[in-house]
Interface confidence: medium
C-alpha cells in the first residue's frame, strides 16, 4: 500500500574538522521510494557537485573534505507523491584548529611612537591570542595591550620594548605559533657629551671629545667654521651603542668646531649638534719666562738656513715644540713667496733664526736671540718695503692670527752685539759689508737707525746673499 514518507532519523548537529569527512543521515520510510533532495542554507546541493557524495538513495550526504565555508544548516527533503513532502534539518559546525591568517612582521619604529604587530587568526572555537617576547609570556600593562583582533599594540615605544616577538593562537583543538619577528626600536641621535671650548696658546694640541648615542649608532662628523675638518686626527670608538669621537687638533688659528651626530631612520635622518670654540690666548713674548730644551734641528723648512745639526731652542710652552715651531716657520715662509728676490733669503734667515733660536745648553737651556743689528739689516735694508707692508697689514688686522707678530721680531727689543757679543746670535747668511752697503739703493727715506756693522760671513753657509746680488 502507498505510504507517505516519514523521516525516521532526524538530522543532528554535526561537528567536523577542516579537511575531514562529515556525514548527514536522513533515514526515510515510505512507499513508493521517495526522491530525497539536500539543501545548504536553503540552496540546493547539486547531485553532480564533486565535493559531495550522495548515497543510499539519497539518504546519506557526505562532505568529502570539509572547508570552513561549509558551515551552515543542511536540510533533507523527502517526497514520493503520497501525502506531503517531509523535511529535517541539522547544522554543520566546522571546528578549526587555530590558524594565523595575518602573522606579525618585522617592525622598525622610532622611540616614543606607537607600534602595532598584527596577528589575525581563524579557528573554531575562536582562538585566544597571547604574545611571547623572547622566551617569556608578554605581560600587558598601561602601554602594552592585545587587541580584540589579536594584534599587539605598544604605545610610546621604549628602547626596552625591542626584541623578538611571536603570537600564540590557542583553542580546544590546538595551538598555533607565528614565526618570530623582530621589533627594532630606533632612537634619534643624541649627544651625551658635548665638546668643550678651549683657550690655548698657538701650537698647542687640543683634543675635543664628543659622545653620542642613538639606534642605529650614529656617525659623528666634525665641522670647522662651517666646513669639514681638513686637518687633525679623529679617533672613534663604539661601545654599548655609544660612539665616542676625539678630534685632536694642532691649533694655529681660532675656530668654531661642531660635532654632528647623525643616524638614519628609513629614508630620513636625525641629527644632533654641539659646538665648541677654540680661541688662541695672547702670546707670551719669546724672551719672557722661556722654558724649553736644546736639541738638534731636524725639521725641513730651515734646513738650508740653519747650520747643519744646529742646536736650537725648543719651547716647551708648546705641546709639541718641534712641530709647532716648524709649522710657524712653514706658515710664515709661505708668505715670503711673494717678496722680492733680495728680501726673501734675508727674511728666511731672520725667520728661521728667530723661531728656531740658537740654544745655549747650560744647566738651564737658554735661547740666544738674534743680534739687533742683523734684525735691523733685514728690516731697513733687505726688506724695507716688505716690512712696511707687513706692519701696515698687521695694524689693519689683515692677518688671520698673531702668528706673523711672532714670526717677525721687534728689532728694538733685541740685544745689541756691541753690549755683549756672546749674548746674541749672528745671521751667517747675511754676508755683506760696508762696501756693499755703499752701492745699495736706498729702500727707505730714513737712514738706518743703527750703524750696520761688518757682518762676518759664515764658511758653513749653504748660500750667501748680498744686497747688490740679484736673485731670480
Amino acid at each position: 500500500l502507498p505510504k507517505a514518507p516519514v523521516i525516521t532519523t532526524p538530522l543532528e548537529t554535526v561537528d567536523a574538522l577542516v579537511e575531514e569527512v562529515a556525514t548527514f543521515m536522513c533515514a526515510v520510510e515510505s512507499y513508493p521510494q521517495p526522491e530525497i533532495s539536500w539543501t545548504r542554507n536553503k540552496i540546493l546541493i547539486k547531485l553532480f557537485d564533486t565535493r559531495y557524495s550522495i548515497r543510499e538513495n539519497g539518504q546519506l550526504l557526505t562532505i568529502l573534505s570539509v572547508e570552513d565555508s561549509d558551515d551552515g544548516i543542511y536540510c533533507c527533503t523527502a517526497n514520493n507523491g503520497v501525502g506531503g513532502a517531509v523535511e529535517s534539518c541539522g547544522a554543520l559546525q566546522v571546528k578549526m584548529k587555530p590558524k594565523i591568517t595575518r602573522p606579525p612582521i618585522n617592525v622598525k619604529i622610532i622611540e616614543g611612537l606607537k607600534a602595532v604587530l598584527p596577528c589575525t587568526t581563524m579557528g573554531n572555537p575562536k582562538p585566544s591570542v597571547s604574545w611571547i617576547k623572547g622566551d617569556s609570556p608578554l605581560r600587558e600593562n598601561s602601554r602594552i595591550a592585545v587587541l580584540e583582533s589579536g594584534s599587539l599594540r605598544i604605545h610610546n615605544v621604549q628602547k626596552e620594548d625591542a626584541g623578538q616577538y611571536r603570537c600564540v593562537a590557542k583553542n580546544s583543538l590546538g595551538t598555533a605559533y607565528s614565526k618570530v619577528v623582530k621589533l627594532e626600536v630606533e632612537v634619534f641621535a643624541r649627544i651625551l657629551r658635548a665638546p668643550e671650548s678651549h683657550n690655548v696658546t698657538f701650537g698647542s694640541f687640543v683634543t675635543l671629545h664628543c659622545t653620542a648615542t642613538g639606534i642605529p649608532v650614529p656617525t659623528i662628523t666634525w665641522i670647522e667654521n662651517g666646513n669639514a675638518v681638513s686637518s687633525g686626527s679623529i679617533q672613534e670608538s663604539v661601545k654599548d651603542r655609544v660612539i665616542d669621537s676625539r678630534l685632536q687638533l694642532f691649533i694655529t688659528k681660532p675656530g668654531l668646531y661642531t660635532c654632528i651626530a647623525t643616524n638614519k631612520h628609513g629614508e630620513k635622518f636625525s641629527t644632533a649638534k654641539a659646538a665648541a670654540t677654540i680661541s688662541i690666548a695672547e702670546w707670551s713674548k719669546p724672551q719672557k719666562d722661556n722654558k724649553g730644551y736644546c736639541a738638534q734641528y731636524r725639521g725641513e723648512v730651515c734646513n738650508a738656513v740653519l747650520a747643519k745639526d744646529a742646536l736650537v731652542f725648543l719651547n716647551t710652552s708648546y705641546a709639541d715644540p718641534e712641530e709647532a715651531q716648524e709649522l710657524l716657520v712653514h706658515t710664515a715662509w709661505n708668505e715670503l713667496k711673494v717678496v722680492s728676490p733680495v728680501c726673501r733669503p734675508a727674511a728666511e734667515a731672520l725667520l728661521c733664526n728667530h723661531i728656531f733660536q740658537e740654544c745655549s745648553p747650560g744647566v738651564v737651556p737658554t735661547p740666544i736671540p738674534i743680534c739687533r743689528e742683523y734684525c735691523l739689516a733685514v728690516k731697513e735694508l733687505f726688506c724695507a718695503k716688505e716690512w712696511l707692508v707687513m706692519e701696515e697689514k698687521t695694524h689693519r688686522g689683515l692677518y688671520r692670527s698673531e702668528m706673523h707678530l711672532l714670526s717677525v721680531p721687534e728689532c728694538s727689543k733685541l740685544p745689541s752685539m756691541h753690549w755683549d757679543p756672546t749674548a746674541c746670535a749672528r745671521l751667517p747668511h747675511l754676508d755683506y759689508n760696508k762696501e756693499n752697503l755703499k752701492t745699495f739703493p736706498p729702500m727707505t727715506s730714513s737712514k738706518p737707525s743703527v750703524d750696520i756693522p761688518n757682518l762676518p760671513s759664515s764658511s758653513s753657509s749653504s748660500f750667501s746673499v748680498s744686497p747688490t746680488y740679484s736673485m731670480t
Epitope: 686626527s233 731636524r298 725639521g299 709639541d320 718641534e322 716648524e326
Partner: antibody, heavy 121, light 112 residues
Framework: ELQLVESGGGLVQPGGSLRLSCAAS????????MSWVRQAPGKGLEWVSA????????YYKESVKGRFTISRDNAKKTLYLQMNSLKSEDTAVYYC??????????????WGQGTLVTVSS | QAVVTQEPSLSVSPGGTVTLTCGLS?????????PDWYQQTPGQAPRALIY???SRLSGVPSRFSGSFSGNKAALTITGAQPEDEADYYC????????????FGGGTKLTVL
C-alpha cells in the same frame, strides 16, 4: 679610519727592481712626513728612508743610498719606494709608516701591515 | 756608525715594574736624539708608544713612561699586564752626517 696599505712586494732576482706603493687614507696625507721601515725575517726593525710632508728633501740609510728612491704624490695620497740593484740582504717585510708631524723625523705613529720583498735567485 | 743598544730580553711578573734601556755604543743618549719607543707583538705591525723621550702617544696606557736614566733613554712599564708581552724597540735620531733614524736591536719582554 686611518689606513696605510702597502703593495708591490714579491719575489725578485738579485740585481732586479721593485716599486713599492703605500696608499694612505683617513688623514691629511700632505700634512705628514712619511717613512719606510723594513724587518728581515726573525730580525729587528731597520729604518730605510724618510721624506717630509712636501717631499722637499729625502733621507736614506747608508746601505740603500743610490739604490733606493723615496717619493710621494700628495694628490694621490701615495708614498713610493723605488728599489733598484736589489741584494739578498734587502729581503724583508717593508712597512710604510706615517710620521707624527710634518718633519721627516717625527715618531712613526701609524704603520701599514707590510709587504714582503724576497730577493733570491 | 754608532750602534743603538738594548737588553736582548727581560722578564717581569704581572703587576710588576720593569725598565728597558736604550743606549749608544759610543756616547750618551740626549734630548737631541729624540728617543722614540715602539711595541711589536708577533705577526703585527709595530705600534708607537713614546716619542721624544717622554711624550705618550694617544691611546697608550699610562703605565708606559719614558725618561732618561744616566746616559741612556729608558722605557718603564709600571704594573705590567700579560698583554705587554712583546718586542720593544727604541729608535734614535742621529743628526750628524746624513740624519739617520736608527732602531735598537729590540728587547723581548716576557710577562711571567
Amino acid at each position: 679610519e686611518l689606513q696605510l696599505v702597502e703593495s708591490g712586494g714579491g719575489l725578485v732576482q738579485p740585481g732586479g727592481s721593485l716599486r713599492l706603493s703605500c696608499a694612505a687614507s683617513g688623514f691629511t696625507f700632505d700634512d705628514y712626513g712619511m717613512s719606510w721601515v723594513r724587518q728581515a725575517p726573525g730580525k729587528g726593525l731597520e729604518w730605510v728612508s724618510a721624506i717630509p710632508w712636501n717631499g722637499g728633501s729625502t733621507y736614506y740609510k747608508e746601505s740603500v743610498k743610490g739604490r733606493f728612491t723615496i717619493s710621494r704624490d700628495n694628490a694621490k695620497k701615495t708614498l713610493y719606494l723605488q728599489m733598484n740593484s736589489l741584494k739578498s740582504e734587502d729581503t724583508a717585510v717593508y712597512y710604510c709608516a706615517k710620521r707624527s708631524g710634518r718633519i721627516a723625523f717625527g715618531a712613526l705613529d701609524a704603520w701599514g701591515q707590510g709587504t714582503l720583498v724576497t730577493v733570491s735567485s | 756608525q754608532a750602534v743603538v743598544t738594548q737588553e736582548p730580553s727581560l722578564s717581569v711578573s704581572p703587576g710588576g715594574t720593569v725598565t728597558l734601556t736604550c743606549g749608544l755604543s759610543s756616547g750618551s743618549v740626549t734630548s737631541s736624539n729624540y728617543p722614540d719607543w715602539y711595541q711589536q707583538t708577533p705577526g703585527q705591525a709595530p705600534r708607537a708608544l713614546i716619542y721624544s723621550t717622554n711624550s705618550r702617544l694617544s691611546g697608550v696606557p699610562s703605565r708606559f713612561s719614558g725618561s732618561f736614566s744616566g746616559n741612556k733613554a729608558a722605557l718603564t712599564i709600571t704594573g705590567a699586564q700579560p698583554e705587554d708581552e712583546a718586542d720593544y724597540y727604541c729608535a734614535l735620531y742621529m743628526g750628524s752626517g746624513s740624519r739617520n733614524y736608527v732602531f735598537g736591536g729590540g728587547t723581548k719582554l716576557t710577562v711571567l
